[in-house]
């Protein structure tokens, strides 16, 4: 697994440099979340071919998968800074089960899936310092995120590796987009 | 890293229009992000544009939103910069550069490949 951001070999070696600020912080979490997505990517392309099939035929899916529109104020078009961090960390907040549901999924990134899950927690305690209106934050019921889970660990293995292979990439378009947006804050 | 060209350049009245691209031979372009900036005699480089991985998600500098329009034809590995009502400040050396995180963003040091750059001269 990728060494956690701020634990690198240039960090050690340099140790008169500035520290980082919270949003730099921030991007060099989400980048670190980015680097782990593409490497089980990697795993999950190489073992299926769930890759080339087309956007289109994978977004008929069940799946209700966090993803930013343009009413949560994270694109140009309406860019508002408070509505679109609550919509980041809710985002957050909602991938966390499908994380869950990743660990257990590969053979040989095993660990990889783990540091993206408890990254994304990392990352959720940062932006939770940022933002300022933490009441507007709906957390996810856990009685709804366990049936959830057990629902999908109960697909059959060709619908467990489509479930899979969407997660990976409905989690690495939802961070790009936030990544985007908070370099605009 | 990978490399890119851009092109498309030239004199161009005021109020006319050029279309400037940056291309790629790299594999795997259609995951990066892709920012145009540019630098006029004697100025800092500005940002001007850029595109995610998600085509959808594109930003604009205050200065240049609604004259430009950025696009990507993934097939061709090519991102495009489409630039309507120009005018004489827009003259400058206009450069792409691509981010590996599909991200893209306002700032220089979020790119990690850079052109060399194509002329656009604004005048008549």
């Known amino acids: 697994a990728p060494v956690p951001p701020g634990e690198d070999s240039k960090d050690v070696a340099a140790p008169h440099r500035q520290p980082l600020t919270s949003s730099e912080r921030i991007d060099k979490q989400i980048r670190y979340i980015l680097d782990g997505i593409s490497a089980l990517r990697k795993e999950t392309c190489n073992k299926s071919n769930m890759c080339e099939s087309s956007k289109e035929a994978l977004a008929e899916n069940n799946l209700n998968l966090p993803k930013m529109a343009e009413k949560d104020g994270c694109f140009q078009s309406g860019f508002n800074e408070e509505t679109c961090l609550v919509k980041i960390i809710t985002g957050l907040l909602e991938f966390e089960v499908y994380l869950e549901y990743l660990q257990n999924r590969f053979e040989s990134s095993e660990e990889q899936a783990r540091a993206v899950q408890m990254s994304t927690k990392v990352l959720i305690q940062f932006l939770q310092k940022k933002a300022k209106n933490l009441d507007a934050i709906t957390t996810p019921d856990p009685t709804t995120n366990a049936s959830l889970l057990t629902k999908l660990q109960a697909q059959n293995q060709w619908l467990q590796d489509m479930t899979t292979h969407l997660i990976l990439r409905s989690f690495k378009e939802f961070l790009q987009s936030s990544l985007r947006a908070l370099r605009q804050m | 890293q990978v490399q890119l060209v851009e092109s498309g350049g030239g004199l161009v009245q005021p109020g006319g229009s050029l279309k400037l691209s940056c291309t790629t031979s790299g594999r795997r372009f259609s995951e990066y992000a892709v920012g145009w900036f540019r630098q006029a005699p004697g100025k800092e480089r500005e940002f001007v544009a850029d595109?995610?991985?998600?085509?959808?998600?594109?930003w604009y500098a205050e200065s240049v939103l609604g004259r430009f329009t950025i696009s990507r034809d993934d097939a061709k590995n090519t991102v495009y910069l489409e630039m309507d009502g120009l005018k004489p400040e827009d003259t400058a050396v206009y450069y792409c550069?691509?981010?590996?995180?599909?991200?893209?963003?306002?700032?220089?040091?979020?790119?990690?490949?850079w052109g060399q750059g194509t002329q656009v001269t604004v005048s008549s």
């Open positions: 550069a691509a981010d590996k995180y599909g991200v893209g963003g306002n700032a220089q040091g979020y790119y990690d490949s």
């Open positions: 595109i995610g991985e998600q085509a959808e998600n594109t």
